[in-house]
């Protein structure tokens, strides 16, 4: 580019940047500064389309700079400018005030409660290592290989054992600090702990002393036994376990005071450690007396096993329990150790899984509950601890006794299986705020049905409707039972049904809700202000 051209360009820029220097009296009223090849001033182009237009243009030639400044300084225009400026700032301040008011008056985000790890999902009990792993495998090293499976269930904790040395009914030959060599070594246990931690699975150790004997607590030498438990708590906490379980506490004399002492040791080590107590009792008063002096104790009992499998009775049991326990964290199971199938017919397993995962508290399952493991279907297997059915080869005793749909392998491949339902529910339970710590409101839905809402603040809400009966039912959802904060919408989206055949994700009209026999529905709907 030549030097001349550069100068030309600068002139163009000056002319564009200082328009007041352009003459405003060009005939067309539109003078243009053009950079030509020569530096010969301005090129004026007169565009006259007709005589009338030219005449009009000649009448008004615009104001000169001096005239413009003179008019702009007149009192009228000054007042107008000030008024507009004032209007602008008032508008701006008004919007600011409006925003502040909206923010202040908008409902506060509810403060999240303190969440312990056992609040965030299910616990999985493996009371019998050998039965869980199957033929010839039952040890800690073998269990380590099953941790991926537990991860796939999205359970938060593994309740293991007891695995300590226990000679039946012999206090002196029971050592809570030693692992029974049949199960492995302390090194195997440490290795299991490390692997479990990497997979975010907590390990809870069962320290029920006389687990091979007639009376879990020996019913003797309670001072010696209690000291052994106390020493074991301290030892295993140092070893890195996340909590403890003791069962059959209805048979431990002065259980409340011992539990309080053991709880102090556990919580004294870390607030993040858990103590679970198990009882065979189903009596609410007995259960409450055990809970009374023990904050943060998780108690598993046979309370719900008395439900008689009717909607009304189950609703009554659940609401009584929640009312009686107030704001303490609950756990939900049908017993302290046994499988769901020892209490429930096969057709109610899905319904109970849905209920246990959606009630407020920690659901606790035994190994095999996720596949509907049933000792009665396996000849010669003990009711308390039947062999886990990993695949069809898991029970070779009677060829053909186990079909693919009874096994982990078979059910993993079937999206409509009990195992698939368990995994989906476990996933929802661990990530949805309303299910994690939401409020609970049960309400009437008609005879035979149990229905409730789980909601937390402005998060997505969940409606659960359970038909315990063996006939189809229409749900008459009585929203009048509900507080204003938990009102029902006209429609809710179907997240899942325990029965096949419904289109998931489709909106269902709540006034026209019909449930199949033994069907449970999990519906979701958004918060509406």
């Amino acid at each position: 580019m030549s030097q001349d051209t550069e100068v030309d360009m600068k002139e163009v820029e000056l002319n564009e940047l200082e328009p007041e220097k352009q003459p405003m009296n060009a005939a067309s009223g539109a003078a243009m500064s053009l950079a030509g090849a020569e530096k010969n001033g301005l090129v004026k182009i007169k565009v006259a389309e007709d005589e009338a237009e030219a005449a009009a243009a000649a009448k008004f030639t615009g104001l000169s700079k001096e005239e413009l400044l003179k008019v702009a300084g007149s009192p009228g225009w000054v007042r107008t400018r000030w008024a507009l400026l004032l209007l602008f700032w008032l508008g701006w301040l008004g919007m600011l005030a409006g925003a502040v008011v909206i923010i202040v008056r908008a409902p506060r985000c509810r403060e999240l409660p303190a969440q312990k790890w056992w609040h965030t999902g299910a616990l999985y009990r493996i009371g019998d290592l050998q039965a869980f792993q199957g033929h010839g495998a039952g040890n800690l090293a073998g269990l380590k290989g099953r941790l991926d499976y537990l991860s796939s269930l999205k359970v938060k904790g593994l309740v293991l054992g007891p695995i300590h040395k226990n000679q039946k009914d012999d206090v002196a030959q029971t050592d809570l600090l030693q692992i029974d060599p049949n199960f492995g070594s302390k090194e195997d246990f440490d290795s299991l702990l490390q692997s479990a931690k990497k997979k975010s699975i907590r390990v809870i150790l069962d320290l029920t002393p006389n687990y091979r004997g007639e009376n879990s607590w020996f019913s003797t030498q309670v001072d010696t036994v209690a000291t052994k438990v106390k020493d074991a708590l301290e030892f295993w906490l140092q070893a890195g376990v996340d909590g403890f379980q003791v069962r059959d506490i209805e048979n431990l004399k002065d259980a409340s005071s011992f539990l309080a002492e053991w709880q102090n040791i556990t919580k004294g080590f870390s607030e993040d450690r858990l103590l679970i107590a198990g009882t065979n009792s189903s009596d609410l008063q007995q259960i409450l007396s055990l809970l009374e002096s023990n904050k943060d104790l998780l108690l598993t009992s046979s309370y719900l096993s008395d439900s008689g499998s009717t909607g009304e009775h189950t609703k009554s049991l659940v609401t009584q329990y929640l009312n009686a326990t107030g704001n303490r964290w609950c756990s939900w199971s049908l017993s302290q150790a046994r499988l769901l199938t020892s209490f429930l017919p096969a057709q109610l397993l899905r319904l109970y899984q849905l209920m246990l995962f959606t009630l407020p508290g920690t659901p606790v399952f035994s190994y095999g509950d996720e596949i509907g493991l049933d000792a009665a279907a396996l000849p010669g297997q003990p009711m308390e601890a039947p062999v886990m059915l990993w695949d069809e080869s898991s029970f070779p005793d009677i060829p053909g006794a186990v079909s693919a749909n009874m096994t982990v392998k078979g059910q993993s491949e079937d999206p409509g299986s009990l195992l698939s339902l368990f995994r989906r529910l476990s996933d929802q339970r661990s990530k949805e705020r309303s299910l994690l710590h939401g409020d609970f409101h049960a309400f009437s839905a008609g005879p035979g049905l149990f229905s409730y809402i789980r909601h937390w603040d402005q998060n997505e809400r969940f409606l659960v409707v359970l038909n315990f009966g063996d006939v189809g039912l229409s749900a008459g959802l009585q929203a009048s039972d509900l507080p204003a904060s938990a009102s029902l919408p006209a429609k809710a989206d179907l997240l899942l049904s325990t029965q096949p055949g419904r289109e998931e994700g489709s909106p269902l009209e709540l006034e026209r809700l019909k449930l199949e026999p033994h069907e449970g529905l999990l519906l979701r709907f958004p918060y509406a202000a």
């Epitope: 007639e214 009376n215 020996f218 019913s219 003797t220 106390k230 209805e250 005071s257 002492e261």
Partner: antibody, heavy 117, light 107 residues
Amino acid sequence: EVKLEESGGGLVQPGGSMILSCVASGFTFSNSWMNWVRQSPEKGLEWVAEIRLRSNNYATHYAESVKGRFTISRDDSKSTVYLQMNNLRAEDTGIYYCSRGDPGAYWGQGTLVTVSA
Amino acid sequence: DIQMTQSSSYLSVSLGNRVTITCKASDHIKNWLAWFQQKPGNAPRLLISGATILETGVPSRFSGSGSGKDYTLSITSLQTEDVATYYCQQYWSTPYTFGGGTKLEIK
């Protein structure tokens, strides 16, 4: 070998006081609940009092008939359990045994307390 | 308070015969029951605790059974050295209570 040895018994007038001691050996005293049990021809064997461990805040329990009059205590450093008896009555007469554990797996030979004018 | 009742104050049994002594609690004691043997001039000796657990050094002819409120001490074949008074005791809840005792004699 586990040994329990009671002492302090004797004759005392009604309304009087007496303190019984029981020295233990052969086991970890501080980890054991300790009891006092008495025996008389009229009442047979009768449990009197129990004291638990330091970790139980040395919790104590008493038979209704001695509540407010008798006090059980322990000194773990001396492996000794005591029974302080006040306002004694004729019906408190008997052989007083100390026993270890729950139930009494080990007993002393007993010390005779006679309450008489 | 839980009352303990031993139905027989005296039992007279021939040597070598089976002996059964019963004890009934007024309330459930969850197997927290002990059996003691006392010979004249001696302190009581613990035979069985936890309703069924035989103490070390106690002959195997002694056995305990029962649950809930009803408990039994059995001697399969009575020996001369078994002549004594037998007491049951509940230690489930304070105040701990003893039965009135059963005096065993040779017929």
